[in-house]
Amino acid sequence: CKAMHVAQPAVVLASSRGIASFVCEYASPGKATEVRVTVLRQADSQVTEVCAATYMMGNELTFLDDSICTGTSSGNQVNLTIQGLRAMDTGLYICKVELMYPPPYYLGIGNGTQIYVIDPEPCPDSDF
């Protein structure tokens, strides 16, 4: 497949509500407008698929209803949000972009965004 450059931030800290957002930007060398974006999680040398969506450039991303991801697109940028994260979900989240159609097919894989998730401290019992 033809290589395509994908850029994403090195580090992101999830919010106290377990939400992390980052931008995945790809340098589209072809004319393809049917694009597939996949978020992969790498931890302990294991790679698992977190979520994926195919969209037409200019459209919003539509993830499956039960997906923990949401996203918007603008030109060659995809703004990804991952929800429901807990401390155990800390890891390297890799953005993979494929230009699916029309040909030629292009594949780009980012270096990954290290997402740190800190579980909030439980609220102490109140005497009031």
């Epitope: 497949c1 290589a3 037409m56």
Partner: antibody
């Protein structure tokens, strides 16, 4: 569940034209190109062309330029194909198809086909 | 356009045996390490069903007895062990470039 529901069979006279439809459901219609294929009886498949449902941009196999016209109606998630100046050579089953999530899977989901018979 | 030549045109095999269908492309369908060759199964009165994509990857819900191999210009579809339900037409298809093209088809029957 992705579904492509095509219109029913057509019996048309030589020289006439026909318009068939392909109603999409189970996915966002504007996120995938719609492709059209022709399969003559007992033969292989020929790619007619594709349309981008987002903006209506089309691209045709040179062989079908001037024969086929592809359109979409975003409001009803329906793609259509118009065939003109029909001859017996145009008698065939016509399919609409959508791509999948694997690389190069341009025809992962298919309509059931529309049979067009050209006869006087 | 890339021309795909399938062989044999028809094939009969015993249940439980291996059936092999070949597809030769007029030029390479490889691009940077990926072979853009797909295989379809078609039964009478039905649309084609995607069996194998990118030469060797199984389509969704496709039984493990279907496998694909090859690169460049020469590809094959293997079915083992053959089952009654495998009686059908089989087509190869390249998706390296537009226009996508299909092979002439192979009719597979049970002996």
């Amino acid at each position: 569940e992705v579904q492509l529901q095509q219109s029913g069979p057509e019996l048309v006279k030589p020289g006439a034209s026909v318009k068939m439809s392909c109603k999409a459901s189970g996915y966002t219609f504007t996120d995938y190109y719609m492709k059209w294929m022709k399969q003559s009886h007992g033969k292989s498949l020929e790619w007619i062309g594709h349309i981008n449902p987002n903006n209506g941009d089309t691209f045709y196999n040179q062989k079908f330029t001037g024969k086929a016209t592809l359109t979409v109606d975003k409001s009803s998630s329906t793609a259509s194909m118009h065939l003109n100046s029909l001859t017996s050579e145009d008698s065939a089953v016509y399919y609409c198809a959508r791509g999948g999530d694997g690389r190069g899977t341009w025809f992962a989901y298919w309509g059931q086909g529309t049979l067009v018979t050209v006869s006087s | 356009d890339i021309v795909l030549t399938q062989s044999p045109a028809s094939l009969a095999e015993f249940l439980g045996q291996r059936a092999t269908i070949s597809c030769r492309a007029s030029e390479s369908v490889d691009s940077y390490g990926i072979s853009f060759m797909n295989w379809f199964q078609q039964k009478p009165g039905q649309p084609p069903k995607l069996l194998i994509y990118a030469a060797s990857n199984q389509g969704s819900g496709v039984p493990a007895r279907f496998s694909g191999s090859g690169s460049g210009t020469d590809f094959s579809l293997n079915i083992h062990p053959m089952e009654e339900d495998d009686t059908a037409m089989y087509f190869c298809q390249q998706s390296k470039e537009v226009p996508p093209t299909f092979g002439g088809g192979t009719k597979l029957e049970i002996k």
